[in-house]
Amino acid sequence: YSHWPSCCPSKGYPSEELLRWSTVPVPPLKPASLDFHSVSCRASEDGPLNSRAISPWRYELDRDLNRLPQDLYHARCLCPHCVSLQTGSHMDPRGNSELLYHNQTVFYRRPCHGKKGNHKGYCLERRLYRVSLACVCVRPRVMG
Amino acid sequence: YSHWPSCCPSKGYPSEELLRWSTVPVPPLKPASLDFHSVSCRASEDGPLNSRAISPWRYELDRDLNRLPQDLYHARCLCPHCVSLQTGSHMDPRGNSELLYHNQTVFYRRPCHGKKGNHKGYCLERRLYRVSLACVCVRPRVMG
């Protein structure tokens, strides 16, 4: 990462917002299958990608209002093995359903302290945060 | 998204950094298969998840030094259909290899202007940015 100039809150420019929420009026895409009323280990022939996959998964919400993004979604596999392409329901032990992980850049809001140690607004702290993105049908590892 | 209090750069607290790059000393995980010298439509029995998948993919780097994160990776499917679990090479036309997309929160750096219109450092602008995360083996949609 190249270094960006440091920057910290101030009451000096109240008309300016560092974080311009107004630039994205739409909420982040909520995964279509967040309602788990009919969650099962089968591959559908319609619906969103995660329900048509032969390694189907559901999404679980991860919310922290002091983090950007505030809402993240973690994938959770519905089957240990891959579902048969033919039937869409029977599992095939030759394939494993494995989580795909990603270290996502997030920012945590924390108190900023002035020279006298008093609370002076908000600062952001960059972190890497591990998120499971999807379940993938893979061939099992063959140990050499 | 809930609203965070506005905050903008100031020279008032030079010892504080709003964006603490130092908090993440390690670079983001580079996908292991970024070198494409032997990329082909087959599912390996070892290596990273994207090469063992029966919907294998490679990663393409998307770098923008005025964006956070500066490096993003886009998945690119290596096969139109899923690879057979049995052979790891022959394609099975009953399954499609489809890209999984995600609208990721990113931040663009732009000049901040003070009350008098002069350049006062950098502000961040939040945007949603479409990224392809992986390729998933799915059952084709059956049109009703």
Partner: antibody, heavy 121, light 108 residues
Framework: QVTLKESGPGILQPSQTLSLTCSFS??????????VSWIRQPSGKGLEWLAH???????FYNPSLKSRVTISKDTSRNQVFLRITSVDTADIATYYC?????????????WGQGTLVTVSS | ENVLIQSPAIMSASLGEKVTMSCRAS?????MYWYQQKSDAPPKLWIY???NLAPGVPGRFSGSGSGNSYSLTISSMEGEDAATYYC???????????FGGGTKLEIK
Amino acid sequence: QVTLKESGPGILQPSQTLSLTCSFSGFSLSTSGMGVSWIRQPSGKGLEWLAHIYWDDAKFYNPSLKSRVTISKDTSRNQVFLRITSVDTADIATYYCARRGYDNYGGFVDWGQGTLVTVSS
Amino acid sequence: ENVLIQSPAIMSASLGEKVTMSCRASSSVNYMYWYQQKSDAPPKLWIYYTSNLAPGVPGRFSGSGSGNSYSLTISSMEGEDAATYYCQQFTSYPYMYTFGGGTKLEIK
């Protein structure tokens, strides 16, 4: 000024369903970022978080009680509800509703006075 | 699930004495919150984000710590400080608010 007040049956029998209401004023659950939790405390013991509901109806539950607990809200009436099915003596406690403060980075800033729930046959 | 262990469970201090109580987490947490509770009353938020005093909390209180280990300190014990103090942490996934078992502070 923010106030929260819990109300409930006081006493109920084992295997019955406990229904609690949290009536609040001084804030709105339609405000982005706002959320209310239910927390309980058996007499002389510690605090146990039960469930949380946000302005956008996102709901979260303590995994140890998830199968028995339901949280809901009526935004227009400034009320949050809690249901616990199949109660037994382990559910005897003072039940609090609490508002998650935003300026205080997620601590529970405002609490109700609590309502005592007893389970007895 | 992260478990918070507070120690000591009960302690007594003389007026004017320095008091320190601890809260240890079974796995690392970002921030800790502390609450004060007196008998027959709901808890009150006392310290947020590890070291920030809630409005109205006397300056003799302080909070510190990181990772697995956090503490609440009273620089000079006063009579009104006798109460039970709970630490609390939050994890966003799986979503959970966890409280410690409490430290009961009495006047010696």
